[in-house]
Interface confidence: low
């Protein structure tokens, strides 16, 4: 049975398409190609006589068509108007005509799209943002990318308008993007330049640092306040409820016991209209809360190198203290094999190596005083030779 096949079926505007013929009968007088789904003399493109090997253009010939002896038809520099059906009529030597219809689709080369937005400075948890991919074109698939990833499944993301519009419901600070849209048709694809959102948010609850509460008289008090916010927050300080200054940092030199009290940091975002405060108690005292001597324990004090691990634990009954570790007068951890956990109370070494042998101790401290544990000795033995390389099987 006579058939035709378009190569390719989807053609880019300006390119060429070959209407390929299969199962062409042997004994032929000639054949003709017509535009459309049926034989219509007014829409003949070209006729070809086998005997004379001569091609004759028809009324629908545009000068871009070439017919081949195997009946295939080449159309060059195609336009979207060339989209549609094409019918081949074969005149066989027994004067029985046979017909076959094929088709192809011409798509434009797509331009670089752009993204328009109805709100480029949305407020977190309040505003929605609608992105629209321009231009609107026929027979085009619209795709969206966030952070170079296809759209995640999320109830806050909605596609509409044939996927041309992406709506973010109730934006968050993590929705900054970048956003890109891509337009596709069967013959081309193009991606927009990235667009980012300036999400206005905050301020979050401020943090006052350092975390110290106790200070000695004569010391300098330097407090810093930070709250996540966009645009950046404006800060002010109050001491015992009385306004002091509008700065992010508060500095009081040579403090006395009279400087004890509640220190309030106030953070304000003029765009969102939101305010947040944090209160910190400062105690200025001569008294030194005595930090008790901590106890140090080891899961084992003699270990096999390159094989065993060891956990050292620093125990104290004091609260509000910090812990640091020392080995041969150097602070730890000093290698990737050493890990601190549980608020620095535990030092883990995994695996233990020869250079880890020696004396360890821990120190507990607060802003006012500190105390050291007795040292503990870690012995490292090597019972057997290690593997030639450090890689484990698999």
């Amino acid at each position: 049975q006579l058939t035709t096949e378009s190569m390719p079926f989807n053609v880019a505007e300006g390119k060429e398409v070959l209407l390929l013929v299969h199962n062409l009968p042997q004994q032929l007088f000639g054949y003709s190609w017509y535009k459309g789904e049926r034989v219509d003399g007014n829409r003949q493109i070209v006729g070809y006589a086998i005997g004379t090997q001569q091609a004759t253009p028809g009324p629908a010939n545009s000068g871009r068509e070439t017919i081949y002896p195997n009946a295939s038809l080449l159309i060059q520099n195609v336009t979207q108007n060339d989209t549609g059906f094409y019918t081949l009529q074969v005149i066989k030597s027994d004067l029985v005509n046979e017909e076959a219809t094929g088709q192809f689709h011409v798509y434009p080369e797509l331009p670089k799209p752009s993204i328009s937005s109805n709100n480029s400075n949305p407020v977190e948890d309040k505003d929605a943002v609608a992105f629209t991919c321009e231009p609107e074109t026929q027979d085009t698939t619209y795709l969206w990318w966030i952070n170079n990833q296809s759209l995640p499944v999320s109830p806050r993301l909605q596609l509409s308008n044939g996927n041309r519009t992406l709506t973010l419901l109730s934006v968050t600070r993590n929705d900054t993007g970048p956003y890109e849209c891509e337009i596709q048709n069967p013959v081309s694809a193009n991606r927009s330049d990235p667009v980012t959102l300036n999400v206005t948010y905050g301020p979050d609850t401020p943090t006052i640092s350092p975390s110290d509460t106790y200070y000695r008289p004569g010391a300098n008090l330097s407090l810093s306040c930070y709250a996540a916010s966009n645009p950046p927050a404006q800060y002010s300080w109050l001491i015992n409820g009385t306004f002091q200054q509008s700065t992010q940092e508060l500095f009081i030199p040579n403090i006395t016991v009279n400087n004890s009290g509640s220190y309030t940091c106030h953070a304000n975002n003029s765009v969102t209209g939101c305010n947040r405060t944090t209160v910190k108690t400062i105690i200025v005292t001569e008294l030194s809360p005595v930090v008790a001597k901590p106890q140090i324990k080891a899961s084992k004090t003699t270990v096999t190198g390159d094989k065993d691990s060891v956990n050292l634990t620093c125990s104290t009954n004091d609260t509000g203290i910090s812990i640091r570790w020392f080995f041969k007068n150097q602070s730890l951890p000093s290698s990737e094999r050493m890990k601190l956990s549980q608020g620095n109370t535990t030092l883990s070494i995994n695996p233990v190596k020869r250079e880890d042998a020696g004396t360890y101790w821990c120190e507990v401290f607060n802003p006012i005083s500190k105390n050291q544990s007795d040292p503990i000795m870690l012995n490292v033995n090597y019972n057997a030779l290690p593997q030639e390389n450090g890689l484990s099987p698999g």
């Epitope: 698939t141 795709l143 759209l151 499944v153 044939g162």
Partner: antibody
Framework: EVQLLESGGGLVQPGGSLRLSCAAS????????MSWVRQAPGKGLEWVSW?????GKGLEWVSRLTISRDNSKNTLYLQMNSLRAEDTAVYYC??????????????WGQGTLVTVSS | QSVLTQPPSASGTPGQRVTISCSGS????????VSWYQQLPGTAPKLLIY???KRPSGVPDRFSGSKSGTSASLAISGLRSEDEADYYC???????????FGGGTKLTVL
């Protein structure tokens, strides 16, 4: 209730042609991408092709098989030309509810058997 | 040979938990969602899991899906005799620009 009903299968000689249809009901057909999936006797599933959702008539081309749709008739088609013995299979039409963003097939027809044999 | 690799068979006794694996590559499972389908003998496939781990309404919570890297798994807990079927994984393949299925796993309930 979503329903997909395939038709048009049967016995055809090698080199012959066949057009399968899939009539859809119970949902807005033009809003969904549709696919054809086939399964040779005793074998696994094999995706044939898909056609995206609206507007109007869509077309995709894979080798000798043309998939098309007519949204006005709520019907999906598969035109199969130059059929070979290896095209023998049950042909299912299936619906993709994700519009192609995370392709999956939530509803399947009961299938129509195409047998290519002389 | 299928683009996604599944074991041809799996088995378990009633009440047991069985897992079926599906291995692919970065062009399919690694960067696209995985679906799982159940095909009871003589019937059309049925969607069990989509988007790696989501269950359509009506699918019992005995069925669960997961994905790690370029591999996915379907777990069936509290195995029942009616779970005896063929199970297929599927995912979009960006390199092939098409949807690919695993070769299927025949689950036998002993």
């Amino acid at each position: 209730e979503v329903q997909l009903l395939e038709s048009g299968g049967g016995l055809v000689q090698p080199g012959g042609s066949l057009r399968l249809s899939c009539a859809a009901s119970g949902f807005t057909f033009s809003n969904y991408a549709m696919s054809w999936v086939r399964q040779a006797p005793g074998k696994g599933l094999e995706w044939v092709s898909w056609v995206r959702q609206a507007p109007g008539k869509g077309l995709e081309w894979v080798s000798r098989l043309t998939i098309s749709r007519d949204n006005s008739k709520n019907t999906l088609y598969l035109q199969m030309n130059s059929l070979r013995a290896e095209d023998t299979a049950v042909y299912y039409c299936a619906r993709d509810p994700t519009k192609g963003y995370a392709p999956t097939f939530d509803y399947w027809g009961q299938g129509t058997l195409v047998t290519v044999s002389s | 040979q299928s683009v996604l690799t599944q074991p041809p068979s799996a088995s378990g006794t009633p009440g047991q938990r069985v897992t079926i694996s599906c291995s692919g590559s970065s062009s399919n499972i690694g960067n696209n969602y995985v679906s799982w389908y159940q095909q009871l003998p003589g019937t059309a496939p049925k969607l069990l899991i989509y988007a790696d781990s989501k269950r359509p309404s009506g699918v019992p919570d005995r069925f669960s899906g997961s994905k790690s890297g370029t591999s996915a798994s379907l777990a069936i807990s509290g195995l029942r005799s009616e779970d005896e079927a063929d199970y297929y994984c599927g995912a979009w393949d960006a390199s092939l620009n098409g949807y690919v299925f695993g070769g299927g796993t025949k689950l036998t309930v002993l």
